[in-house]
Interface confidence: medium
């Protein structure tokens, strides 16, 4: 933003320093320089002298007019040409901003990731405002009527320790900037209903010899939630369409899921879980790759997530790293 300077006059913007993008605006510059009747007043935008749409109003004041101003930010200053002065004399400067009022925040979602100790609330902020926009998240206990407010620029993490007004809450979001304010609908939550189990992870895969070769995917989660429903999706890397298998899971031991897959094809697997009967899913796990052997395997071997593998009695893929899934939108 603008830093403190000693002005020899005044610069102001109509209708305001922050205004709606696309508006017509006027910037006024009024000189107050000792022993100087300005011959000329100059306006600079981002350091470049403006040539057009400048009107001299009186001996000390000039106006610069912009039609349909679309720049999100500009630094303006004005100078005067004084008689007997070799250089232009600085009058004053101002930062101006254009943007939009906030949209109504929607899709307000609050979840508690198991072991995180936080309730994470997110929302769709709508179109880009271009100007500083703040969000106030209101959390009101339906049992005690106590209301807490949290100021943020994006999402918010609220410590579950601070949610001491029971289990039921109303959550809503207010968006505000210099051009307007909007408020979301209220979301009613029950803390027990919004827990997302600890992430499920695929650890390895193997294709074993049988009448029809089958691939076993090993996967696990550190969750302490007893009733968990999971989905595993898989596809050949050359395909667009996913196949999905559903499981009711007990994570007291590592899960083994069997698949009958085509030979000599690279497959990708992902898994996600939710507490059975609840609303929110985990995001899909990292991509896990496994290539099936060419024909019925003969000898034992291991392979990693990459393409390297040897045909054998057991063809294995071991998770050695994580490629981030792009499916974070599956929470809702």
């Amino acid at each position: 933003g603008i830093t403190n300077i000693n002005c020899s006059g005044h610069i102001w913007v109509e209708p305001a320093t922050i205004f709606k993008m696309g508006m017509n605006i006027s910037i006024y510059c009024q000189a107050a320089i000792k022993n100087c009747q300005p011959r000329k007043l100059h306006f600079y935008k981002n350091g470049i002298k403006e040539r057009f749409q400048i009107t001299r109003i009186n001996k000390t004041t000039a106006r610069l007019w912009y039609k349909n101003f679309l720049e999100p930010h500009a630094s303006m200053y004005c100078t005067a040409e004084c008689p007997k002065h070799f250089q232009e004399t600085l009058i004053c400067g101002k930062d101006i901003s254009s943007g939009y009022p906030p949209d109504i925040p929607d899709e307000v979602t609050c979840v508690i990731y198991e072991y995180s100790g936080n309730m994470t609330c997110t929302w769709n902020a709508g179109k880009l405002t271009y100007i500083d926009t703040k969000y106030v998240v209101h959390v009101k206990s339906l049992e005690t009527e106590e209301e807490q407010q949290y100021l943020t620029s994006s999402y918010i993490n609220i410590s579950t320790d601070s949610l001491q007004g029971g289990k039921k809450y109303l959550v809503w979001v207010q968006a505000a900037n210099a051009l307007g304010m909007e408020e979301s609908k209220q979301l009613q939550i029950h803390l027990d209903d919004i827990v997302i189990p600890s992430a499920a992870v695929i650890s390895r895969a193997e294709t074993i010899n049988a009448t029809v070769p089958k691939t076993i995917i090993y996967w696990d989660s550190q969750t302490t939630i007893e009733k968990v429903s999971c989905e595993m999706r898989y596809k050949a890397t050359t395909n667009q369409t996913w196949n999905v298998k559903e499981f009711d899971t007990n994570f007291t031991y590592v899960q083994q899921s069997e698949f009958y897959l085509e030979p000599n094809i690279k497959y990708v697997f992902q898994v996600r879980c939710q507490e059975t009967g609840k609303r929110y899913w985990q995001p899909w796990s990292s991509l896990f790759f496994h290539k099936t052997p060419e024909t019925v395997p003969q000898v034992t071997s291991k392979a990693f997530q990459h393409d390297t593998w040897n045909s054998g009695l057991t063809v294995a893929s071991i998770s050695t790293g994580h490629l981030t899934s792009d499916n974070r939108g599956d929470i809702g």
């Epitope: 603008i2 830093t3 610069i11 600079y44 981002n46 200053y77």
Partner: antibody
Amino acid sequence: DVQLQESGPGLVAPSQSLSITCTVSGFSFNTYAITWVRQPPGRGLEWLGVLWPGGGISYNLALKSRLTISRDSSKSQVFLEMNSLQTDDTARYYCARNWRHYDGSYAMDFWGQGTSVTVSS
Amino acid sequence: DIVLTQSPLSLFVSLGDQASISCRSSQSLVHSNGNTYLHWYLQKPGQSPKLLIYKVSNRFSGVPDRFSGSGSGTDFTLKISRVEAEDLGVYFCSQSTHVPWTFGGGTRLEIK
């Protein structure tokens, strides 16, 4: 004569903040803009931002969330602050005076010698 | 952001020969006021950059007349008519028409 002198910490730990001072002499803030530029070892120049004579600031948007440029006119100093530093912020940081041609052409006519900043644990 | 692409990356020239460096912009550098704010800098080994040419073709004070700039719109050229030993270093083009200001990647001039 015109001089610009940068002073910085030299070594900064990752995730920490950087503060560099540019002390100028031989000209007035009210006539010239001051620009900050950095140059990673063996690489090209990257524009960080400019402090205009009117006191306004334009930032490189890619870095704006981590950058603050300010000044203390009484001490003829301009400040660059950058937070959440990572190893790829290792560079020589320059301040430069912007010479304004009569039509407002800002080209950097005088540069400081730069201050080397290494981000490392 | 405006991307400035310089070519060649390196230039090997014999003393007394001519050298030519190109700078191409991803967008026109003509400002709405009609001016083109394209500048050239030279950074000698171990030194800060120095201004050579401002606004396409204007030599900065103290810059020898063997340096000349030309071009318009998106294509610009810096020429050194007779290369001297003191000219070696990295040449950068830069634009200040649009914020953020940007620099080209640099052209290293080396003596054969």
